[in-house]
Interface confidence: low
């Protein structure tokens, strides 16, 4: 059959890995595109063909099985280079057809070198750690699969350039790297290199996240506003501009979303026909609690407008909350030749 | 004469629900990738979801992703898209297409109108 | 995801004129780019695949070219049923994208 149900260019999966270091590539289609498994399929009678394009070609052409050492290979519905080679860079098809039926997908692969620190064009993961939180522990990502249980590979953990040991708060335990009480100063980029043999040869595998330490769930608290508060009045004469910032602080917590906005008589500003605009700004600590302003403004204010309710509210996972602002019209100062005139008797 | 024809538009209220239908006829179905797209009021085509010929492999757009459901039934030579919690940007002319690789969407529906409105 | 611009907004041209519309997408397609048109009310048709192939049924005076990041649909000499909105579209990368489109219009 001529027909191919094609997936296209998969940018999704943005492939990066490290230049003279063992990489294990699972064909797209079985984990994002078809219902079924490779084995299911392989049961089936349906075989996996993989193809490539070099970087900066548009011709398509066979994966050379038959290189020294077995250096690509094909094993079940994974690719496998043992090692990388900067010019192994480009798109990779894999097809799953018979003659019945056809699936494919393409997804770029970048090969990257890297420096002596482990600097790199590699997108690292960042995870986030709780701070003075107690254990936590992030684990060496993506190793799985490259070496059977029976082997014991060696593992060496850095932070930035520097091997981790006596460290104070910082153990290297395996494949895992545990922080007894995160604090800010662990922020930073580490690395784990895991050395393991295979057939006689030595392979090494080069993995680095990004630690971020961030507020503690414990230290969490509702949404605060700042402003509007009880000591601010916004006086206004008709026809000035109305100013009034809603300030709110949020605590940082995983996943929350951050709102905050403004209603007048009860109703959100879109809602309502006076000329009102908003504008916001947000800021972060360092542990990304996070500072959110939206400044409501309306540039010539009538007397009406100075009636309405005013009100900020704000809400995250820990909860909602709300603050009237006090607005209120300015009295306008006496005029002597009348007002206070009168007020000393004169007729 | 290859056609599709959409069906299932209308006035609903947001958070609730829709499943539109195109019917194929000129071709069969299960030979082709078929997909949604949409187009609000007055502006630009957005690509909605993809399904590949028999089914097996579904894409969403993000904006859509675990609210709308693509599904087909070759036997009947339809295409669905099962609609929930809807929102008001999701008003639109909602159109089937048929998809190949090398030809893009080289046959579509005349669109069905979806409008999400209180 | 690839952004697809397409220029002008709006093109005025008299019939029988040459119409040029651009297209550029903000990392290579390849040449798996299609160009649609669209009159008021209809749906799309497509006019170009593959950056230059015309679809089944389309007149010669429709041509397609470019590829990489920039592409163009030319109009050789403008017919009445010509005024519409073109758009292109990429289907490299998933997911698809269009362009937000070009109006053809009477001068």
């Known amino acids: 059959s001529e027909r191919c149900d094609d997936w296209g260019l998969d940018t999704m999966r943005q492939i990066q890995v490290f230049e003279d270091e063992p990489a294990r590539i699972k064909c797209p289609l079985f984990e994002h595109f078809l219902k079924f498994n490779y084995s299911t399929a392989h049961s089936a009678g349906l075989t996996l063909i993989w193809y490539w394009t070099r970087q900066d070609r548009d011709l398509e052409e066979p994966i050379n099985f038959r290189l020294p050492e077995n250096r690509i290979s094909k094993e079940k519905d994974v690719l496998w280079f043992r090692p990388t080679l900067l010019n192994d860079t480009g798109n990779y098809t894999c097809m799953l057809r018979n003659t019945t039926y056809c699936s494919k997908v393409a997804f770029p692969l970048e090969v990257v070198q890297k420096d002596s620190c482990f600097n790199s064009p590699m997108k690292l993961p960042v995870h986030k750690l709780y701070i003075e939180y107690g254990i936590q522990r992030i684990t060496c990502p993506n190793v799985d699969g490259y070496f059977p249980s029976s082997v014991k590979p060696t593992i060496t953990w850095y932070m930035g350039c520097y091997k981790i040991q006596n460290f104070n708060n910082v153990i290297p335990e395996g494949m895992n790297l545990s922080f007894l009480i995160a604090l800010i100063s662990n922020n930073g980029n580490y690395t784990c290199v895991v050395t393991y043999p295979e057939n006689g040869r030595t392979f090494h595998l080069t993995r680095t996240l990004t630690v971020k330490v961030v507020g503690s769930p414990k230290n969490a608290v509702p949404p605060v506003i700042h402003s509007p508060n009880d000591h601010v009045v916004y006086e206004k004469e008709p026809g000035e501009e109305l100013l009034i910032p809603c300030t709110v602080y949020f605590s940082f917590l995983m996943d929350s979303r951050n709102e905050v906005w403004w209603t007048i008589d009860g109703k959100k500003p879109d809602d309502i026909t006076i000329d009102v605009t908003i504008n916001e700004s947000i800021s972060h600590s360092r542990t990304e609690d996070e500072t959110r302003t939206q400044i409501l403004s309306i540039k010539k204010v009538t007397s009406e407008d100075l009636k309405r309710s005013y009100v900020c509210h704000a809400r995250s996972a820990k909860g909602e909350v709300a603050k009237a602002a006090k607005v209120k019209q300015k009295v306008p100062a006496p005029r002597y030749t009348v007002e206070l005139a009168c007020g000393f008797g004169a007729t | 004469e290859v056609q599709l024809l959409e069906s299932g538009g209308g006035l609903v209220q947001p958070g609730g629900s829709l499943r539109l239908s195109c019917a194929a006829s000129?071709?069969?179905?299960?030979?082709?990738?078929m997909s949604w797209v949409r187009q609000a009021p007055g502006k630009g085509l957005e690509w909605v979801s993809a399904i590949s010929y028999d089914g097996e492999g579904t894409l969403y757009a993000d904006s859509v992703k675990g609210r709308f459901t693509i599904s087909r039934d070759n036997s009947k030579n339809t295409l669905y898209l099962q609609m929930n919690s809807l929102r008001a940007e999701d008003t639109a002319v909602y159109y089937c297409?048929?998809?190949?690789?090398?030809?893009?969407?080289?046959?579509w529906g005349q669109g069905t109108l979806v409008t999400v409105s209180s | 995801e690839i952004v697809m611009t397409q220029s002008p907004a709006t093109l005025s041209v008299s019939p029988g004129e040459r119409a040029t519309l651009s297209c550029r997408a903000s990392q290579s397609v390849s040449s798996n780019l299609a160009w649609y048109q669209q009159k008021p009310g209809q749906a799309p048709r497509l006019l170009i695949y593959g950056a230059s192939t015309r679809a089944t049924g389309i007149p010669a005076r429709f041509s397609g070219s470019g590829s990489g990041t920039e592409f163009t649909l030319t109009i050789s000499s403008l017919q009445s049923e010509d005024f519409a909105v073109y758009y292109c579209?990429?289907?490299?990368?998933?997911?698809?994208?269009f362009g937000q489109g070009t109006k053809v219009e009477i001068k």
């Open positions: 579209q990429q289907y490299n990368n998933w997911p698809w994208t």
């Open positions: 000129g071709f069969t179905l299960s030979g082709f990738s």
């Open positions: 297409a048929r998809f190949r690789y090398y030809t893009a969407f080289d046959y």
